[in-house]
C-alpha cells in the first residue's frame, strides 16, 4: 500500500467546509481495504509560535529541526500527551463516524478523502489517513495532513506560511 496526502497543510475559517485529500495505491486488490482517519491534537501551538518566535520552546524546536531536518515539532510527540480520536472509518461504501464525531456532517469521499461540511472549534490538529489491508502489508500505509481552524480571516498567509487557506467567506 502507498498512501499519499497531496496537500498536507490546510487553514480554514470556522464553519467553512474543508476536504483533506488522501489517496492510496495497492499492489494487489482482492478486497477493499479499510480506510481509517484519526485525529491527533497538535504537539505544539502553531499560532503561538508564529506570534512569538523567541519563546524558549521555539528555540529548542529550531535546534531539534537543525539536528533532524525531517522532524516536525507540531506532529511528532507521544500520543499520551495529546488528544487522539478516530474520526471516521470506511470499508466498501460504508462510512462510520467515531463516537466524538457522531452527528457531524463528516464523511470519507472519493478514494479516501476526509470531508467536513462545516468545521468546528476543536477540529484544529493533525489528521492521519491510514489504509489497512491484510493482503498488502508492504509500503507506507499512513500519511497526515495538518488542519488549522481560525476565527478570523486576517493574516493567514503571513501567520502560517506554507498552509493552504480554504474558503474565507464569513
Amino acid at each position: 500500500i502507498q498512501v499519499t496526502v497531496s496537500d498536507p497543510y490546510h487553514v480554514v475559517i470556522l464553519f467553512q467546509p474543508v476536504t483533506l485529500p488522501c489517496t492510496y495505491q495497492m499492489t494487489s486488490t482482492p478486497t477493499q481495504p479499510i480506510v481509517i482517519w484519526k485525529y491527533k491534537s497538535f504537539c505544539r501551538d502553531r499560532i503561538a509560535d508564529a506570534f512569538s518566535p523567541a519563546s524558549v520552546d521555539n528555540q529548542l524546536n529550531a535546534q531539534l529541526v537543525a539536528g533532524n531536518p525531517g522532524y516536525n515539532p507540531y506532529v511528532e510527540c507521544q500520543d499520551s500527551v495529546r488528544t487522539v480520536r478516530v474520526v471516521a472509518t470506511k470499508q466498501g461504501n460504508a462510512v462510520t463516524l467515531g463516537d466524538y464525531y457522531q452527528g457531524r456532517r463528516i464523511t470519507i469521499t472519493g478514494n479516501a478523502d476526509l470531508t467536513f461540511d462545516e468545521t468546528a472549534w476543536g477540529d484544529s490538529g493533525v489528521y492521519y489517513c491510514s489504509v489497512v489491508s491484510a493482503q498488502d502489508l508492504e509500503g507506507n500505509n499512513e500519511a497526515y495532513a495538518e488542519l488549522i481552524v481560525l476565527g478570523r480571516t486576517s493574516g493567514v498567509a503571513e501567520l502560517l506560511p506554507g498552509f493552504q487557506a480554504g474558503p474565507m467567506e464569513d
Epitope: S52, S55, I148, S154, G155
Partner: antibody, heavy 115, light 110 residues
Framework: EVQLVESGGGVVQPGRSLRLSCAAS????????MHWVRQAPGKGLEWVAV????????YYADSVKGRFTISRDNSKNTLYLQMNSLRAEDTAVYYC????????WGQGTLVTVSS | QTVVTQEPSLTVSPGGTVTLTCASS?????????PTWIQQKPGQAPRALIH???YKHSWTPARFSGSLVGDKAALTLSGVQPEDEAEYYC?????????FGGGTKVTVLG
C-alpha cells in the same frame, strides 16, 4: 527582570478616544507577541486583542472589533491600544501581557468612560 | 458566542486538595485549546500559573498542577496554603481568539 508598565488611562466621555501604552523592558520585546486584557470593576478578565512580534498579525475580541486598534513600536519597546468610539462598558483596568501564554502582566491602567 | 465555564467558588481547608475545572460551550476541551490558568489576588495584577494544559512557569509552586479531566481542563491545588486564596481564571484559545472563564474564587478556611 521583565517589566510591563501601562499608561494613558483616565476619564473620558462616551464616543471619545484614548490611547494606552505599555512600556516593556527586561526581554527582547521585538520577538514576542503581546496581548491586551481588561477587567471591569468587580468583574472577571476579558481578552481584548493580540499582536504578533512584528505587528503583521492582529486579532480582536468581537466586543472591540472596529473600534480598537492594537499596534507596537519595536524600536521603542512599546505596545499600544488605540481606543475609539468608547462606551460605558469599556470602563475597566487594561493590562498588557507578554507572549501568547500571558506569562508576564503589567499592573494595569484604569480607563473610565463616563459623561 | 463561545463561553468558558468555571465553578463560581470553591472552599478548601489548609493542607487539603481542590480541583478547579474549565469547560467550553463548543464541546470537549482538548490540549488543542492550550488551556492556561491565571491567578489573581485581591488588589493585584493577574499572574500566570500554568500554560499549555500542564506546563508550569518557573515561579509556579509545585502544589499547582494542570491536566485534562474528562471533557474539561483542570487545575489541582494539593496541600493548599492560606496564600492560595485567590481568583483563578481559565483561558482557552480558539484559533486566533482567546476566551477567559468567569473565574473561580477559592477560599481557604481558617
Amino acid at each position: 527582570e521583565v517589566q510591563l508598565v501601562e499608561s494613558g488611562g483616565g476619564v473620558v466621555q462616551p464616543g471619545r478616544s484614548l490611547r494606552l501604552s505599555c512600556a516593556a523592558s527586561g526581554f527582547t520585546f521585538s520577538s514576542y507577541g503581546m496581548h491586551w486584557v481588561r477587567q471591569a470593576p468587580g468583574k472577571g478578565l476579558e481578552w481584548v486583542a493580540v499582536i504578533s512580534y512584528d505587528g503583521s498579525n492582529k486579532y480582536y475580541a468581537d466586543s472591540v472589533k472596529g473600534r480598537f486598534t492594537i499596534s507596537r513600536d519595536n524600536s521603542k519597546n512599546t505596545l499600544y491600544l488605540q481606543m475609539n468610539s468608547l462606551r460605558a462598558e469599556d470602563t475597566a483596568v487594561y493590562y498588557c501581557a507578554k507572549d501568547l501564554n500571558m506569562d508576564y502582566w503589567g499592573q494595569g491602567t484604569l480607563v473610565t468612560v463616563s459623561s | 458566542q463561545t463561553v468558558v465555564t468555571q465553578e463560581p467558588s470553591l472552599t478548601v481547608s489548609p493542607g487539603g486538595t481542590v480541583t478547579l475545572t474549565c469547560a467550553s460551550s463548543t464541546g470537549a476541551v482538548t490540549s488543542g485549546y492550550y488551556p492556561t490558568w491565571i491567578q489573581q489576588k485581591p488588589g493585584q495584577a493577574p499572574r500566570a500559573l500554568i500554560h499549555t494544559t500542564s506546563y508550569k512557569h518557573s515561579w509556579t509552586p509545585a502544589r499547582f498542577s494542570g491536566s485534562l479531566v474528562g471533557d474539561k481542563a483542570a487545575l489541582t491545588l494539593s496541600g493548599v496554603q492560606p496564600e492560595d486564596e485567590a481568583e483563578y481564571y481559565c483561558l482557552l484559545q480558539y484559533g486566533g481568539a482567546w476566551v477567559f472563564g468567569g473565574g473561580t474564587k477559592v477560599t481557604v478556611l481558617g
